[in-house]
Interface confidence: medium
Amino acid sequence: IWSAVFLNSLFNQEVQIPLTESYCGPCPKNWICYKNNCYQFFDESKNWYESQASCMSQNASLLKVYSKEDQDLLKLVKSYHWMGLVHIPTNGSWQWEDGSILSPNLLTIIEMQKGDCALYASSFKGYIENCSTPNTYICMQRTV
Amino acid sequence: IWSAVFLNSLFNQEVQIPLTESYCGPCPKNWICYKNNCYQFFDESKNWYESQASCMSQNASLLKVYSKEDQDLLKLVKSYHWMGLVHIPTNGSWQWEDGSILSPNLLTIIEMQKGDCALYASSFKGYIENCSTPNTYICMQRTV
């Protein structure tokens, strides 16, 4: 019994996949795929706006944290990276690039420094930082 | 132009994937897929032998580091985890579970403790540890 059939269009061969195994994606080439989300960690330091532009140019957005369960790989991420969370001064809320509000209990927000952008750090922490500060960043693409 | 055709056997629909995008795997369900290798990080602490047995029971092996380029996701891994590297006292070499010798310049080996097993740590470091010490571990499955 097989859960899926993958048609290799190049050789027109069927590759059989056991029920317990599956393909992940699709994702941009050489991105990380996990629970059908695509992630990429970028080494070069950019400010938040440049990081956002870089992700957008790759048909992605900055990291959005929406589920500790579906994104449990993030708890093992080392260092600090820009994510897509921004502060809306008018109502004081934190929201994602797509306009959705940060769900309670998803991130521990550490608001010690002045800023309207947030760095993701391991164990689901968000450090508030000046948006102009250069940092590495994480892009994410949700698969359909 | 599309790089692959994925046949969804459940609904029998063809999903078209742009040239720049691709599927990754196949991997065990909910494992991380990167450059067609499958990885899983296990939270429970086990000694090296138990960790090896756990990976084997999932048709995988403990992490093997074979390429900084193909496995660059490992540089951002937080904490320390058993990998499949063991010390061979007879000839003093370090080898992987599959019997291959550790390639030079792949890992910085740090002998913090007396032992014959190695923990993987971020930035391609290997920490020598007593094989009986419980630690979290990384399983890996190479896709065909």
Epitope: Y80, M112, Q113, K114, S123, Y127 | S123
Partner: antibody
Amino acid sequence: QVQLVESGGGVVQPGRSLRLSCAASGFTFSSYAMHWVRQAPGKGLEWVAVISYDGSNKYYADSVKGRFTISRDNSKNTLYLQMNSLRAEDTAVYYCARYDNTRIFDYWGQGTLVTVSS
Amino acid sequence: QSVLTQPPSVSEAPRQRVTISCSGSSSNIGNNAVNWYQQLPGKAPKLLIYYDDLLPSGVSDRFSGSKSGTSASLAISGLQSEDEADYYCAAWDDSLNGYVFGGGTKLTVL
């Protein structure tokens, strides 16, 4: 370059009060959280208190809670530590330190000595 | 009694390697970044290692940090006489809502 200069230390009797200041220069003071850390003579470092960039968040060590108050005046680029009900065990060199998200205490002052003695 | 536990003193000969341990709990080292500070006699502390194992610019690569579970270590290789100092580990503690230091380790270069 970043500079932190503490002042206000001295000898004070038990039960009395003292206010320490830390003058900051060489960086945008109003953007950074700041800490006070102390060190009793011949002893180790002990964290005392932290204040967020705008003064809205403050945390204290249990040993000083209710007696010490951390504050800041961003218009003067100055950090303060108001110490009330002083005890002999508060005798220490008090350091102010800048907090950075990624490096925690990346810059320290040279310290000011507070001696609580009758 | 410090929340983080370090050996009071260590000593080693020049050019040798020494390791200083730091033991904590899940609420500090286990869940937060560990930093190491060097304090030379009569001086203010200086940041030596941040985020477990990263070196600030200007710090010699003879210093290295590591962390496993609720313990951390500082290693100094190629010991020099100018390394004689007190070394402190530190981390934020989620339970105490405060920053905690180890008791400090005095390094003597023989």
